[in-house]
């Protein structure tokens, strides 16, 4: 049974990761940024079902594609690059769910922009949460 | 309106250790980069280290494996752990607040802590 710790270290991590995918978000929807039509071009995959934690495996197989869209922000400035927002993702993802089972993902028929796929792993995490507190 | 707060600048010996601190306040939002950058006489300033609140992080070259920065999200305050100062590492050191990880503008500046690496 999970303890009182466990949950607590569980929730935190869900938080960082719903904290680092709006940051995400934000930044794509954000007025000034020029590739966002071309962001939107790009089709990603949906979990049919996406409940639980092992769930976060249809995440962390879409996160080099979400990597490769990020990229087309090339700014003179990057505070964060997007590879150092991938790679905490999939840090947290990968403790999340958990490597004792293997969980073979199903997708949905339909594919999605960034910013439907964004909010669909933010509406996971926040639904996760509540559950926790 | 953001105001940032730096402490913990200083003189330190080659080698040594200094550890920065940036406390946040006002309008503040709880998804934002928060990070330091550092000019030193007659050069640009450049990134050191940034962090989401997210807990994202991004090092310049010259100091990765030397410099830790960290954040407490309830405190809105960002940290600069500095071990095996070099001199020069001795720069003016600004904390940098962003809402946004791609920003080619940064939001709000802090007005900069000394850092001296000397013997």
């Known amino acids: 049974a999970p303890t009182s710790s466990s949950t607590k270290k569980t929730q935190l991590q869900l938080e960082h990761l719903l904290l680092d995918l709006q940051m995400i978000l934000n930044g794509i929807n954000n007025y000034k940024n020029p590739k966002l039509t071309r962001m939107l071009t790009f089709k990603f995959y949906m979990p049919k079902k996406a409940t639980e934690l092992k769930h976060l495996q249809c995440l962390e197989e879409e996160l080099k594609p979400l990597e490769e869209v990020l990229n087309l922000a090339q700014s003179k400035n990057f505070h964060l690059r997007p590879r150092d927002l991938i790679s905490n993702i999939n840090v947290i993802v990968l403790e999340l769910k958990g490597s004792e089972t293997t969980f073979m993902c199903e997708y949905a028929d339909e594919t999605a922009t960034i910013v439907e796929f964004l909010n669909r792993w933010i509406t996971f995490c926040q639904s996760i949460i509540s559950t926790l507190t | 309106e953001v105001q940032l707060v730096e402490s913990g600048g200083g003189l330190v010996q080659p080698g040594g250790s200094l550890r920065l601190s940036c406390a946040a306040s006002?309008?503040?939002?709880?998804?934002?980069?928060m990070g330091w950058y550092r000019q030193a006489p007659g050069k640009q300033r450049e990134l050191v280290a940034a962090?989401?609140?997210?807990?994202?992080?991004n090092y310049a070259d010259s100091v990765k494996g030397r410099f830790t920065i960290s954040r407490d999200n309830a405190k809105n305050t960002v940290y600069l752990q500095m071990n095996s100062l070099k001199p020069e590492d001795t720069a003016v050191y600004y904390c940098?607040?962003?809402?946004?990880?791609?920003?080619?503008?940064?939001?709000?500046w802090g007005q900069g802590t000394q850092v001296t690496v000397s013997s």
């Open positions: 940098a607040y962003a809402s946004s990880w791609y920003e080619d503008e940064t939001d709000y």
């Open positions: 006002g309008s503040i939002f709880s998804i934002n980069v």
């Open positions: 962090i989401s609140s997210g807990g994202s992080t």
